[in-house]
């Protein structure tokens, strides 16, 4: 008897998902000697165990705890860069500024970046056809719960000055519904974090507005201030020049505002 397979609204598990996770794990432990102790087979088993045979709308943070434990990693708590809707530039930045870290520079973030996955209730199959969409189907799906879990832990680990890169080209520069707005902001620890510094990245070359005065940035400032964390904001008018100056700080053109 052919089994009825749930059709979800989102794309299915990324092709070659297990092989990709394994290859990334091996690569990461090669590049980061401090993580050489990690057993990638155990990591895969824990990752798989979080969602296989479970209803893909019924995933909990608890499901990911074995994986979280295996992926425990110490990053310098004062070198954390959060981002919202501007992942590529954030990653380009930490590739140059090697002492700063986004979530995707940690093992667990690196493993899952840009991947989709889900299983099916009561079968050991991975569903490559479709997975739940956060809006159209359910929020407690394997991918969303994973990022909520790792994002919360990442924010909780932060200390001193925490930086966040925000996309100034979007209608909501700060979006309360983003992972940054709904998870990370609320899990920064006021007893450890002194300041949240927002970097608002401008899109247009001729855009000279002070986007730090944007209503959504003021909303972010209000939320942060109520949590007894100081807030500061900088406009990054020229992201290309900004990156160039991170690479070559001595360049004479890097003394002016970017």
């Amino acid at each position: 008897v052919p089994r009825w397979r749930q059709q979800w609204s989102g794309p299915g598990t990324t092709k070659r998902f297990p092989e990709t996770v394994l290859a990334r794990c091996v690569k990461y432990t090669e590049i980061h000697p401090e993580m050489r102790h990690v057993d990638c087979q155990s990591v895969w088993d824990a990752f798989k165990g979080a969602f296989i045979s479970k209803h893909p709308c019924n995933i909990t943070e608890e499901d990911y705890q074995p994986l979280m434990k295996l992926g425990t990693q110490t990053v310098p708590c004062n070198k954390i860069l959060l981002w919202s809707r501007i992942k590529d530039l954030a990653h380009q930045f930490t590739q140059v500024q090697r002492d700063m870290f986004t979530l995707e520079d940690t093992l667990l973030g690196y493993l899952a970046d840009d991947l989709t996955w889900c299983g099916e209730f009561n079968t050991s199959k991975i569903n490559y056809q479709s997975c739940p969409d956060w809006r159209k189907d359910c929020s407690n799906n394997p991918v969303s719960v994973f990022w909520k879990t790792v994002s919360r832990r990442f924010a909780e680990a932060a200390c001193d000055v925490v930086h966040v890169m925000l996309n100034g080209s979007r209608s909501k520069i700060f979006d309360k519904n983003s992972t940054f707005g709904s998870v990370e902001v609320h899990n920064l620890q006021p007893e450890k974090v002194q300041t949240l510094e927002a970097w608002v990245i401008h899109g247009g070359r001729e855009d000279s507005r002070d986007l730090c005065q944007d209503p959504t940035i003021k909303e972010l400032e209000s939320i942060i201030s109520k949590r007894n964390i100081q807030f500061s904001c900088k406009n990054i008018y020229r992201p290309d020049k900004f990156l160039q100056c991170v690479k070559n700080p001595e360049d004479s053109s890097c003394t002016s505002e970017i």
Epitope: E19, E30, R36, V38, Q41, W44, K48
Partner: antibody, heavy 120, light 109 residues
Framework: KVQLQESGPGLVKPSQTLSLTCAVS??????????WSWIRQHPGKGLEWIGY???????YYNPSLKSRVTISVDTSKNQFSLKLSSVTAADTAVYYC????????????WGQGTLVTVSS | QSVLTQPPSVSVSPGQTASITCSGD??????VCWYQQRPGQSPVLIMY???KRPSGIPDRFSGSNSGNTATLTISGTQTMDEADYYC???????????FGGGTQLTVLG
């Protein structure tokens, strides 16, 4: 051109540990980008993947053999090794070492294979 | 019993096209590789990542993979192609790489 050569005893007693070494020449294990694997073939039968190791020491084993398998690497000697414990007659096979890409399955260089017989 | 199913044998006349199939659950979502093994010799990689040929492998060998079936096609089959052929791919249920049971290709004549 990369060459692989298996070595080790051709006869192992039941319940003992099978130990094989694969010497790699014509390329460095430490250069990265490849998994170093063990694969076996029972007499007159198909192939069975046993497991791999990366030069950094990261391993992945066939889950059905995992409890008995250990693969290790010695980058200074440019070789990797297989240990299979508690062997039975069912472990009698030709054992191959091979080099594979990081997505697995694509073993582009193989040793000539060594027959290991498990018998008392 | 392998989770990747291959026909035990396939026969073809010289110059004709031989097709060897490899079937498994969600196979199209994983890379498939193919090996040729002549009697008494080590296997040789003839196809990787579904459709790519290593250097030195003639272009009469081609591959495809979609749905639950991968196919190795040998066009203009020659007597030297007589050998065992194995597919290999990741298997989700076993969480490891598995080989098909193998197909013995016989070139008639």
């Amino acid at each position: 051109k990369v060459q692989l050569q298996e070595s080790g005893p051709g006869l192992v007693k039941p319940s003992q540990t099978l130990s094989l070494t694969c010497a790699v020449s014509g390329g460095s294990i430490s250069s990265g980008g490849y998994y170093w694997s063990w694969i076996r073939q029972h007499p007159g039968k198909g192939l069975e993947w046993i497991g791999y190791i990366y030069y950094s020491g990261s391993t992945y084993y066939n889950p059905s053999l995992k409890s008995r398998v250990t693969i290790s690497v010695d980058t200074s000697k440019n070789q990797f090794s297989l240990k299979l414990s508690s062997v039975t007659a069912a472990d009698t096979a030709v054992y191959y070492c091979a080099r594979g890409g990081v997505m697995g399955g694509d073993f582009d260089y193989w040793g000539q294979g060594t027959l290991v017989t498990v018998s008392s | 019993q392998s989770v990747l199913t291959q026909p035990p044998s396939v026969s073809v006349s010289p110059g004709q096209t031989a097709s060897i199939t490899c079937s498994g659950d969600n196979l199209g979502d994983h890379y498939v590789c193919w090996y040729q093994q002549r009697p008494g010799q080590s296997p040789v990689l003839i196809m990787y990542e579904d459709t790519k040929r290593p250097s030195g492998i003639p272009d009469r060998f081609s591959g495809s993979n979609s749905g639950n079936t991968a196919t190795l096609t040998i066009s203009g089959t020659q007597t030297m192609d007589e050998a065992d052929y194995y597919c290999v791919a990741w298997d989700d249920s076993l969480s490891g790489w598995v080989f098909g049971g193998g197909t013995q290709l016989t070139v008639l004549g």
